[in-house]
Amino acid sequence: AGGPGSRARAAGARGCRLRSQLVPVRALGLGHRSDELVRFRFCSGSCRRARSPHDLSLASLLGAGALRPPPGSRPVSQPCCRPTRYEAVSFMDVNSTWRTVDRLSATACGCLG
Amino acid sequence: AGGPGSRARAAGARGCRLRSQLVPVRALGLGHRSDELVRFRFCSGSCRRARSPHDLSLASLLGAGALRPPPGSRPVSQPCCRPTRYEAVSFMDVNSTWRTVDRLSATACGCLG
């Protein structure tokens, strides 16, 4: 049960992937007044498997405290789990006007950078 | 001193850019025994200016506590400041052997994803 195969699968389950949640339109920060819910898809998870030699050394330097990054902007030592495709999201506002916002929700993810 | 120009410059200083530091080879995690220092260049800084509509809504949802990301993998609400080009780094190990590690140091950065 604890062999390499099972460990790799467990790590993969935490990897970069598309996730989905119903969210209130008003929390999207679009400035539209609406009490509706919409489905918002986003990307999250690890991209450790896609690390370059630079990333491995950067992680080692950060871990050893040998690098002094500027305050508030710690460098990223793996590619980022980010959307590679998007879709529009539609909803009804409080005036019963149908609104569509382009490229609001992710439809695919990748380890970018 | 507090006009728009200075604000823009200050923001620029926090933006994604190439940074450089002398670091001990032994802290690079390469497995090479060496007491040398090398120049390691890396990328850090904000990519807020490159945010998409998706990113703005994702940031709003996270700020409002309306999104439940999985534990330990908070989604990234802006492109990542990451290397776009790399260079080799060379150094002498304790046996006076010249070592070269490809693609170890960054030479250019960009807001990716």
Epitope: R17, L18, S20, L22, P24, S34, D35, E36, L37, V38, R39, E87, A88, V89, S90, F91, M92, S96, W98, T107 | -
Partner: antibody, heavy 122, light 107 residues
Framework: EVQLVESGGDLVQPGGSLKLSCAAS????????MHWVRQASGKGLEWVGR??????????EYGASVKGRFTISRDDSKNTAYLQMNSLKIEDTAVYYC?????????????WGQGTMVTVSS | DIQMTQSPSSLSASVGDRVTITCRAS??????LNWYQQKPGKAPNLLIY???TLESGVPSRFSGSGSGTDFTLTISSLQPEDFEIYYC?????????FGQGTKVEIK
């Protein structure tokens, strides 16, 4: 808290009628489609029908087994949907769920009510 | 109507096992396929949206894949709370249809 609450389930004789209600709270559903799904005891899930939103002129569609007998309606001002069931048959006995389907390129049964029991028996 | 066929209809497994449930559509449905978990006496709960998107709050051990007519739901390491009934459902065409369900039981 976002929730749907069904009511109106009862014991009714074959050939009788019953009207189920589904009230939404914690959000408004005027932009969403409202569906009804049922489940007979120990059986799988069966789609009953749906009513679309105002943009789609409140269009309704029904499953073959209930078409012509059941009618779905909605009152967006009350955030409530209804299922009018006429000419009930013994095989209509089931737990009835109302479900919200939010707009999307691909749709899913997003928010489910707790279900209300309809028993058709003589 | 589009027929959805799930297999197996039931399976016995142990905690920690990797489990795969398949769902086949009678015609191509692209990725208009959702997976639900149902606990006794409760309404179903959406697990996987659009064939492979993990619904928020659902543990990462669940994953979905497939497109067209063949789809799978995988649980990478079964936990005690996963011994329930699972349904696939297509939203490609009206009437929306479900698979007959797969009951995951303790071995």
């Amino acid at each position: 808290e976002v929730q749907l609450v069904e009511s109106g389930g009862d014991l009714v004789q074959p050939g009788g009628s019953l009207k189920l209600s589904c009230a939404a709270s914690g959000f408004t559903f005027s932009g969403s489609a409202m569906h009804w799904v049922r489940q007979a005891s120990g059986k799988g899930l069966e789609w009953v029908g749906r009513i679309r939103n105002k943009v789609h002129r409140y269009a309704t569609e029904y499953g073959a087994s209930v078409k012509g007998r059941f009618t779905i309606s909605r009152d967006d001002s009350k955030n409530t949907a209804y299922l009018q069931m006429n000419s009930l048959k013994i095989e209509d006995t089931a737990v009835y769920y109302c479900v919200v389907v939010v707009p999307g390129s691909i749709e899913a049964f997003d928010i489910w009510g707790q279900g209300t029991m309809v028993t058709v028996s003589s | 109507d589009i027929q959805m066929t799930q297999s197996p209809s039931s399976l016995s497994a142990s905690v920690g096992d990797r489990v795969t449930i398949t769902c086949r559509a009678s015609q191509s449905i692209s990725t208009y396929l959702n997976w639900y978990q149902q606990k006794p006496g409760k309404a179903p709960n959406l697990l996987i949206y659009a064939a492979s998107t993990l619904e928020s709050g659902v543990p990462s051990r669940f994953s979905g894949s497939g497109s067209g007519t063949d789809f799978t739901l995988t649980i990478s390491s079964l936990q005690p709370e996963d011994f329930e009934i699972y349904y696939c459902q297509q939203s490609y065409n009206i009437p929306w249809t479900f698979g007959q369900g797969t009951k995951v039981e303790i071995k």
